[in-house]
Structures are given as structure tokens and as C-alpha cells.
């Protein structure tokens, strides 16, 4: 549950990701936003980054949390099939911003059931540690739908 | 582990300029966004400027918007801080502060530069 | 902005005993799409740097002590220490992360 121990690498697409829309009429506004004109702006700005910034901190909570473990337990988990090895090694793969735009390339829960499943077999499988708990957080008391809904709205996929 | 030292405070004359500093190590400095938050005894703790890892996105708070601007050198590992038409208001300790994974959230302070203005 | 206050102003509690602050924001703070409450708190030693103790009102950052521990929801929130320690004597502030970055206005603990 460390901060200071992230995976940089995997943190940097933050900032960046949560520039304004490149939309030809907001042209000015975003103009104005990266040169912080408006204290609002940064609200916006904050807005944006926390559902990517919750999503980051899950894979670095996991990630720290397996580079603590023991090597030959991990192996053992994966060969028991209590580790879903190939969710896992896809997630600890790739960056956060790659990971929200496989959440968001469906447009809802209907429209992606296998991910939203693999989502949720994650957390089910997950149940001894934080990962788990975050994961249903979002899965189980708020709904996956909702919360992917949100991330369409904001437009992450659409940021350059 | 990480370290953050402010430098250039001093004591300047309202209407003047200075320009603080924070050097940072023990940390990919160009991966994390860095803020400015100062610390005046009347008024606690005040946050002052933002600026994203990748310099695209700067902000500020309304006490100092166009007066101050925040930059960074990454190649440098190097925070600045840029105060024009400093009045007595902006006396305070200035600090340099790391950005968590998580946006506005600190996880590393420096030590802070006192700044006076005063004639 | 949201307005944070805390109380009490200064507290003074005896070592081994619990010491508890409070805080409160002028608006919620806590962010449905996760339930989570944007709520984090410092310490400030003398000559020392500012330290982040909890963050999401109730996650100890790493390497600080178990007896630290936060709690709250919404506006209303709570800085305990279970059992005071000599090295605790600082002043204590919360801040809110959900929107523009304000802090309460501090809370000096010493020791009776």
C-alpha cells in the first residue's frame, strides 16, 4: 500500500493523459488550461486524473505486493491455479494507460461480458490481499458498469 | 531516498523578483508532477503551483496567478519557482513538495525557503 | 475551494495515552466512483520536513507506525494515535486532494 514504492515507468502517462480535449472548439480554453489561467481548470484537471490514478495504484498495490512475496510460493500459486497468471502477467505488462483504454474500448458492460469477467474473476481470486478489496470496491458495491461508464465519459481513449 | 532542498529566499523588497529552487534526487524526477505550497504563520499552509512530469499542464492558486510561474528541468532534476511583484502577503516558507501516484497528495516535502518581503 | 478545520487547536495528552484530532471539510470529499475519501494527513516536526502519515482518510503510508491510524467519511474526519510517544510532539494538519489542495490549519500535540 506504499507510495513511495511505485513502478515509475508505469506513472508517468498520468499527467499527460489527463491533458484537455484536443477539440478544435476548445481551442482557447485549452490554451488557457495549460497555462493554468483558471483555478477551476485544475479541479477539472484532478477530475480526470483520479479515476486513472485509483487504477494505477491498484497495479502498483498488486505489483509491490508480489514482488514481496516469496519467488517460490508465487510459483506454486501459479500452479495451483489459485493465480489467474494470465490476467496477471497482462496487467503487470502493461501501463495503466493501456489498461483503462482495454476497460473503455467497449461501451459498457453489455457490449464486453468476457472482460468485465476477467475483471471480476481478478478480484473473486484475489481475496487475501488489497488488490482484491479495491477491486470490489468498484465491482461489488458500486458496479463495474458505472464506473467504466464514468471512464467513457471522460474521454480517456480520446486524449493524445 | 528522496531528498527535495529548496534554495534562493531571501529578504526582498515589495515589487521585486526572486527565484527559488529545489534540487530533487532519489527519485525518476520526470515521472512525478511537483508542486509549490507555502507556509506563512498567519495563514497555515497554502498551496501555491502545480507542474506536470511532462511540463504540458502548470496551475496555480489565485493569490499568485500571474505573478508567479513554475518550471522544471528535468535534465537537471530541477523545480523552479519564479515570483514577480512580491508584496508582503507572499512572505512565508516555501516548500517543494513530490507528487504521490496519486494527483495533489505530497508524499515528500523539502525543508523550505524562507522568503520575506519587506522594505 | 473547500475550507478544512481542525480541532482542537492544541492538544496536550500524557505518554501512552490516546490522542485524537479531528477534521472537517466545508464539502464531501469522497469520490462515489470508488469510495473513497480524499482525505490525507501530515506531520510537521521542528527543522524537519513534512510527513505524509495517512492518505484516502485511513491508509498508513508505508513505514508509519501502527499507532497511527485515520478514520472518517464525507466532512467528518479523525487523526488517533493509540499510544503517544515522546517523537510524537508535532503539529498535525489534514488535507484534502479532491479538489484544488487546501489544509486545516494545524493541530499542535504535546505532551502533559
Known amino acids: 500500500r506504499s507510495l513511495q514504492d511505485t513502478e515509475e515507468k508505469s506513472r508517468s502517462f498520468s499527467a499527460s493523459q489527463a491533458d484537455p480535449l484536443s477539440d478544435p472548439d476548445q481551442m482557447n480554453e485549452d490554451k488557457r488550461h495549460s497555462q493554468g489561467t483558471f483555478t477551476s481548470d485544475y479541479s477539472k484537471y484532478l477530475d480526470s486524473r483520479r479515476a486513472q490514478d485509483f487504477v494505477q495504484w491498484l497495479m502498483n498495490t498488486k505489483r509491490n505486493r508480489n514482488n514481496i512475496a516469496k519467488r517460490h510460493d508465487e510459483f506454486e500459486r501459479h500452479a495451483e491455479g489459485t493465480f489467474t497468471s494470465d490476467v496477471s502477467s497482462y496487467l503487470e505488462g502493461q501501463a495503466a494507460k493501456e489498461f483503462i483504454a482495454w476497460l473503455v474500448k467497449g461501451r459498457g458492460r453489455r457490449d464486453f461480458p468476457e472482460e468485465v469477467a476477467i475483471v471480476e474473476e481478478l478480484g473473486r481470486r484475489h481475496a487475501d490481499g488489497s488488490f482484491s478489496d479495491e477491486m470490489n470496491t468498484i465491482l461489488d458495491n458500486l458496479a463495474a458498469r458505472d464506473f467504466i461508464n464514468w471512464l467513457i465519459q471522460t474521454k480517456i481513449t480520446d486524449r493524445k | 531516498q528522496v531528498q527535495l532542498v529548496e534554495s534562493g529566499g531571501g529578504v526582498v523588497q515589495p515589487g521585486r523578483s526572486l527565484r527559488l529552487s529545489c534540487a530533487a534526487s532519489?527519485?525518476?524526477?520526470?515521472?512525478?508532477?511537483m508542486h509549490w505550497v507555502r507556509q506563512a504563520p498567519v495563514k497555515g499552509l497554502e498551496w501555491v503551483a502545480f507542474i506536470s512530469n511532462d511540463k504540458s499542464n502548470t496551475f496555480y492558486a489565485d493569490s499568485v496567478k500571474g505573478r508567479f510561474t513554475i518550471s522544471r528541468d528535468n535534465s537537471k532534476n530541477t523545480l523552479f519557482l519564479e515570483m514577480n511583484s512580491l508584496t508582503a502577503e507572499d512572505t512565508a516558507v516555501y516548500y517543494c513538495?513530490?507528487?504521490?501516484?496519486?494527483?495533489?497528495?505530497?508524499?515528500?516535502w523539502g525543508q523550505g525557503t524562507l522568503v520575506t518581503v519587506s522594505s | 475551494d473547500i475550507v478544512m478545520t481542525q480541532s482542537p487547536d492544541s492538544l496536550a495528552v500524557s505518554l501512552g495515552e490516546r490522542a485524537t484530532i479531528n477534521c472537517k471539510s466545508s464539502q464531501s470529499v469522497l469520490y462515489s466512483s470508488n469510495n473513497k475519501n480524499y482525505l490525507a494527513w501530515y506531520q510537521q516536526k521542528p527543522r524537519q520536513p513534512l510527513k505524509l502519515l495517512i492518505y484516502?482518510?485511513?491508509i498508513r503510508e508505508s513505514g508509519v507506525p501502527d499507532r497511527f491510524s485515520g478514520s472518517g467519511s464525507g466532512t467528518d474526519f479523525t487523526l488517533t494515535i493509540s499510544s503517544l510517544q515522546a517523537e510524537d510532539v508535532a503539529v498535525y494538519y489534514c488535507q484534502q486532494f479532491y479538489s484544488v489542495p487546501t489544509f486545516g490549519q494545524g493541530t499542535k500535540l504535546e505532551i502533559k
Open positions: 532519489g527519485f525518476t524526477f520526470n515521472t512525478y508532477g
Open positions: 484516502w482518510a485511513s
Open positions: 513538495a513530490k507528487e504521490s501516484i496519486l494527483a495533489a497528495l505530497f508524499d515528500y
